[in-house]
Amino acid sequence: IRAEKAMVDGSWLDLAKRSKLEAQPFAHLTINATNIPTGSHKVSLSSWYHDRGWAKISNMTFSNGKLIVNQDGFYYLYANICFRHHETSGDLATEYLQLMVYVTKTSIKIPSSHTLMKGGSTKYWSGNSEFHFYSINVGGFFKLRSGEEISVEVSNPSLLDPDQDATYFGAFKVRDID
């Protein structure tokens, strides 16, 4: 009887753990390449997939190009941005490129915007070379409040690699705020 009770308790515990896990907010958003802006200046990327391929979202909201936090908590945020150029893509206007990503938090309640993470490098990409590639990965642990919005900005968006395994960002809640 004791063993049976332990098994029942254990299964209830597993169920409780599982349901709590399922309620934990997360998002993995992949680039929607049909709507990438042009130019070399820093731009906000507003077109992301949230429900196809590797992209998924749960207990967070994606709206107007921004990932919106629905639950207070400590979150791990990450972004991976790949830049690439092939000679068939066109003629590079300069060899000197600043390839950057900025992950930004915007608060509506107290109107403010903060860069949480940035990464990148200056690169020399000769237009006479056949192929160039560069990847940036940033990640960090942040306290986020309900209603705050996360967005991604990049330089030289025309060079973005449009594959879902190349250009993406996301977040997952790690713990509550005490």
């Epitope: 130019g39 066109g90 590079l92 206007a93 300069t94 060899e95 000197y96 000769s126 237009g127």
Partner: nanobody, 126 residues
């Protein structure tokens, strides 16, 4: 005021060579890509070649690849086009143009170029 002045055109026999120059003033020459275009009688303006601001990368239309060479001297604010193995079909007015847009990629569409010279005539005939 931006000014682009081409020179070096003329009459040349097939197989001959010419060197076109384009003197630029009124803007920071070394900061911007430049291009050469041409317009044959009764035809539209077509891309010939372009070069980045530093001169490190050069691009050519397939029809001139291996025969024409674009270069620039940023100290002299001058753009060049060395034309070898000239053919009768190269006969046209040649224009230099400045690309001032902050784009990652250069366009080969002449309408995207902001400033133009008055052109210099190149005639290839025997």
């Amino acid at each position: 005021e931006v000014q682009l002045v081409e020179s070096g055109g003329g009459l040349v026999q097939p197989g001959g060579s010419l060197r076109l120059s384009c003197a630029a003033s009124g803007f920071t020459f070394s900061s911007y890509p430049m291009g050469w275009f041409r317009q044959a009688p009764g035809k539209g303006r077509e891309f010939v070649s372009s070069i980045t601001g530093s001169g490190g990368s050069t691009y050519y239309a397939d029809s001139v690849k291996g025969r024409f060479t674009i270069s620039r001297d940023n100290a002299k604010n001058t753009l060049y086009l060395q034309m070898n193995s000239l053919r009768p079909e190269d006969t046209a007015v040649y224009y230099c143009a400045a690309y001032i847009r902050p784009d990652t990629y250069l366009s080969r569409d002449y309408r995207k170029y902001d400033y133009w010279g008055q052109g210099t005539l190149v005639t290839v005939s025997s």
